[in-house]
């Protein structure tokens, strides 16, 4: 079951997967100037068996003005540039991605991919935060939301990570903890 | 389903003290912010604080600091809020919601009413 | 801290009509806003967060719209169930603020 929306934005911090549930989608999207190729896919699927999970299709993309080019090969480091916010700099590793059952990686890049990505998440997917660059986290508990079923519809539990600046931070008496860590769960919510 | 239960209405006299509790269920209720508002009568609300239970961290709004004191017991799924010494301006309802941003589940409130 | 303000205090409209209700804060809090409806003698219930995310379980009528430090919540086609009093809640500064409220009566 697809999740209906994206996981929710938090001020001053970003989100990223560590791994992918499958039946997770991610959109074959190609930056300005190029498109998929005619017979390319439209999303990349993760799939799998009860002991390997891997992405099904591959994304290619083609450049708008020619008609033939359909290279596939990893872009050079300048052309890798920033993703969207599930994309963090210093990735945080909760999990061994490879070690996840039922779970894909994050998929290599492919050669004239959009800057950002888009993945449509399944019930069950997990994400995890992290405050940005000059924020610090109030409290060291769980920093995650996962997609869950309720009354028939999905949502997303809300992430419980504070993210302060130096400012907002003096406010409050009592001393600072360490950045967040994803240990704590709080997806253990009671469906109906 | 998720649920917070509040304690029943209080009727106090200045000086007194006090100390109402919140029960969560449904969650897991050690690993959610719980996040104290208050409602004056015929007023609006006001965001006094927040609680994390599993080590009851907490956090004041300066217009509510040293004047309430929010604690929890993890084991029992609880959140307190209490004072020392009440005052007739602390007549209100006061609510527990889960947090920490926005309060997608609320208790039914708890009435205080602080009069001599 | 940030202040909200909502406008109007109260609104008077009837049973089909669209209604706004305006909130400013006084400086820009990007999308992080929330908006809540309450009836008399009951607990606040979440409508909307992120400024225009409709929360599980309400109805399509209510929308949010805005950024910066304007918003407005819009409730199209008004209902006898929607005459309660609505207020928004900044929570991009941790300290949270919320607006005085709207009352929406009827007419």
């Known amino acids: 079951e697809l999740c209906d929306d994206d996981p929710p934005e938090i001020p001053h911090a970003t989100f990223k997967a560590m791994a992918y549930k499958e039946g997770t989608m991610l959109n074959c999207e190609c930056k300005r100037g190029f498109r998929r190729i005619k017979s390319g896919s439209l999303y990349m699927l993760c799939t799998g068996n009860s002991s390997h999970s891997s992405w099904d299709n591959q994304c290619q993309c083609t450049s708008s003005a020619t008609r033939n080019t359909t290279k596939q090969v990893t872009p050079q480091p300048e052309e890798q540039k920033e993703r969207k916010t599930t994309e963090m700099q210093s990735p945080m590793q909760p999990v061994d991605q490879a070690s996840l059952p039922g779970h894909c990686r994050e998929p290599p890049p492919w050669e004239n991919e959009a800057t950002e990505r888009i993945y449509h998440f399944v019930v069950g997917q997990m994400v995890y935060y992290q405050c940005v660059q000059g924020y610090r986290a109030l409290h060291r508990g769980p920093a995650e939301s996962v997609c869950k079923m309720t009354h028939g519809k999905t949502r997303w539990t809300q992430p419980q990570l504070i993210c302060t600046g130096e400012m907002e931070t003096s406010q409050f008496p009592g001393e600072e903890k360490p950045q967040a860590s994803p240990e704590g769960r709080p997806e253990s919510e009671t469906s109906c | 389903e998720v649920q917070l239960v509040q304690s029943g209405a209080e009727v106090k006299k200045p000086g007194e003290s006090l100390k109402i509790s919140c029960k969560g269920s449904?969650?897991?209720?050690?690993?959610?912010?719980i996040v104290w508002v208050r409602q004056m009568p015929g007023k609006g609300l006001e965001w006094m604080g927040i609680?994390?239970?599993?080590?009851?961290?907490?956090r004041y709004s300066p217009s509510f600091q040293g004047q309430v004191t929010f604690s929890a017991d993890k084991s029992i799924s609880t959140a307190y809020l209490q004072w020392s010494s009440l005052k007739a301006s602390d007549t209100a309802m006061y609510y527990c919601t889960r947090g920490p941003y926005y309060s997608d589940y609320w208790g039914q409130g708890t009435l205080v009413t602080v009069s001599s | 801290d940030i202040q909200m303000t909502q406008s109007p205090s109260t609104l008077s409209a009837s049973v089909g009509d669209r209604v706004s209700i305006t909130c400013r804060a006084s400086q820009s809090i990007g999308s992080w806003l929330a908006w809540y409806q309450q009836k008399p003698g009951k607990a606040p219930k979440l409508l909307i967060f992120?400024?225009?995310n409709l929360e599980s379980g309400v109805p399509s009528r209510f929308s949010g719209s805005g950024s910066g430090t304007e918003f407005t919540l819009t409730i199209s086609n008004l209902q006898p169930d929607d005459f309660a009093t609505y207020y928004c809640q900044q929570y991009n500064s941790y300290s949270l603020t919320f607006g005085g409220g709207t009352k929406v009566e009827i007419k």
């Open positions: 609680i994390y239970p599993d080590d009851s961290e907490t």
């Open positions: 992120e400024a225009s």
């Open positions: 449904g969650y897991s209720f050690a690993n959610y912010w």
